[in-house]
Interface confidence: low
Amino acid sequence: LPKAPVITTPLETVDALVEEVATFMCAVESYPQPEISWTRNKILIKLFDTRYSIRENGQLLTILSVEDSDDGIYCCTANNGVGGAVESCGALQVKMKPKITRPPINVKIIEGLKAVLPCTTMGNPKPSVSWIKGDSPLRENSRTAVLESGSLRIHNVQKEDAGQYRCVAKNSLGTAYSKVVKLEVEVFARILRAPESHNVTFGSFVTLHCTATGIPVPTITWIENGNAVSSGSIQESVKDRVIDSRLQLFITKPGLYTCIATNKHGEKFSTAKAAATVSIAEWSKPQKDNKGYCAQYRGEVCNAVLAKDALVFLNTSYADPEEAQELLVHTAWNELKVVSPLCRPAAEALLCNHVFQECSPGVVPTPIPICREYCLAVKELFCAKEWLAMEEKTHRGLYRSEMHLLSVPECSKLPSMHWDPTACARLPHLDYNKENPKTFPPMTSSKPSVDIPNLPSSSSSSFSVSPTYSMT
């Protein structure tokens, strides 16, 4: 007899792991044999869909390789034309080990801003997400929270938040770890120690000190009255993200010195500035009152004769003192090409030390004249013959200009080293050096009528002369 369909085994909830097989059974009793159709989420499953296998006259539905998208309500419907159609439904719960679908990435962030490290996960049951910083589980606090999505949010990022992070997704089926990522916290440049203002005497050395920090470590530049510092020496050291810069200056004029700390954040820069003034006590322009100023010798004619980085007096009665004095010594130097080998080194030393006198910095920069004894040694001992010839020429008016006369001192007007040893300059080139004597040609003249300590009195002795330029 015809019989309407009856589903004898209603569908149940099926749990299946991804890539596993899942089977729904829909046993039907009826006569004639029913037609059985299947739906997923009310959408008909087509018989020729290769992801499914339908057997036993449609009573068995097998999902051959479960995907996470197969989750849903599956229904079977049986109809044989006798009575109405019958339906039974069951759920497929796709169980899934945790999977991190959007892992965290390296982040560079400026201190004080908000950082979000993403960590989006999949899994069934829904995984719980936690974070590890370094080697330890990250504890949430008022600034740090794991969002519903699994992402880590850090408010008001601090330097101590920098480090290595990874997220962990966990459910009953397993655990997934993200790769380790780096959170780098960048800090705007900040000056820790500003340079101090100074009030100093003319010609003093001053060191301005500026300390800055930041991430990355900033660079420090110095500005003098709005321009890059053109003189002075800068020493820098970096320790524990702190840069220390010292600018040593030789002060010949007042100025505003600015320390600028700069660091880079992506395409942008951050800067911090601090300024200090250097004023000169009882400042009056050297050109007006002091008749000159002290400066390091940076010419070329006397650089083998004067001490390295010698502080020399530049006479501001010339429009361009450095140039004029160099020209003066240059002109006279050329005349020394013809003098005797005995005279020449001594004359060069006298010439350079007379034109570029040693300078005593102070409120009033003061030239230190050559000691009379050294001048007389050149005149009467080393260069007696040449000196006489030169004086003769002078009397006869053979010199075209007075220039060379300015470069020859009048020994009698110079201070003696016996009056005040600090008031006059010695010529080390003429001092006897027992360790390293450089022998002059034998002298035939008798003992000079000057008293120079350490100058030997015998005619066979040696004198120390610093090497001078080759005049070829």
Partner: antibody, heavy 121, light 112 residues
């Protein structure tokens, strides 16, 4: 009449060497500083090197330091530029120039006509 | 390394006045840079015009004068003539740890 005559230019392969000379006449050579200045085809002037009157010190543009050597022989009244490890960017007309005698680097008050150096493979 | 800047090109009418300038990419040009000016006509070697800011080389006409104006060196040609059409270069002495001499990129002056 003051004259500066450069020689020694030519075609050289990258990595090669050349020695330029500049013969001076008509002035007291050993009283003046000298310089080499170059000019790439269609480009501006570029200071290369300088030497004072006595050869006591030498100065170079940063990009040629360690490759070029300036020297002078005052007896022969000649300035030299030894160029090693030449690069294509060294291609230029090289001028020898006399300094005006001021300290530091001084103006260049007399120039030679130049010698062409071509660095190419 | 500081860059020396000049106007790429300028023009002047015969008899007119033109000022060429020479600046520094970072900072001001001062007399301590001893600004020098050179003239170069096509196919010729350069020739010195002005040295140390405002001094004329011998044989240079008085219509060429040098100065420092504001934060730049300046070359002024007063009463320009057709033969003044040339490239003009400034040269600056630099001292920042080591001595250096740097030319500007040059100004092409056209006398219309």
């Amino acid at each position: 009449e003051l004259q500066l005559v450069e020689s020694g230019g030519g075609l050289v392969q990258p990595g090669g060497s050349l020695r330029l000379s500049c013969a001076a006449s008509g002035f007291t050579f050993d009283d003046y500083g000298m310089s080499w200045v170059r000019q790439a085809p269609g480009k501006g002037l570029e200071w290369v090197s300088a030497i004072p009157w006595n050869g006591g010190s030498t100065y170079y543009k940063e990009s040629v330091k360690g490759r070029f050597t300036i020297s002078r022989d005052n007896a022969k009244k000649t300035l030299y530029l030894q160029m090693n490890s030449l690069k294509s960017e060294d291609t230029a007309v090289y001028y020898c120039a006399k300094r005006s005698g001021r300290i530091a680097f001084g103006a260049l008050d007399a120039w030679g006509q130049g010698t062409l150096v071509t660095v190419s493979s | 390394q500081a860059v020396v800047t000049q106007e790429p090109s300028l023009s002047v009418s015969p008899g007119g006045t033109v000022t060429l300038t020479c600046g520094l990419s970072s900072g001001s040009v001062t007399s301590s840079n001893y600004p020098d000016w050179y003239q170069q006509t096509p196919g010729q070697a350069p020739r010195g015009l002005i040295y140390s800011t405002d001094s004329r080389h011998s044989g240079v006409p008085s219509r060429f004068s040098g100065s420092i104006s504001g934060n730049k060196a300046a070359l002024t040609i007063t009463g320009a003539q057709s033969e003044d059409e040339a490239d003009y270069y400034c040269g600056l002495y630099m001292y920042s740890g080591s001595k250096n001499y740097v030319f500007g990129g040059g100004t092409k002056l056209t006398v219309l």
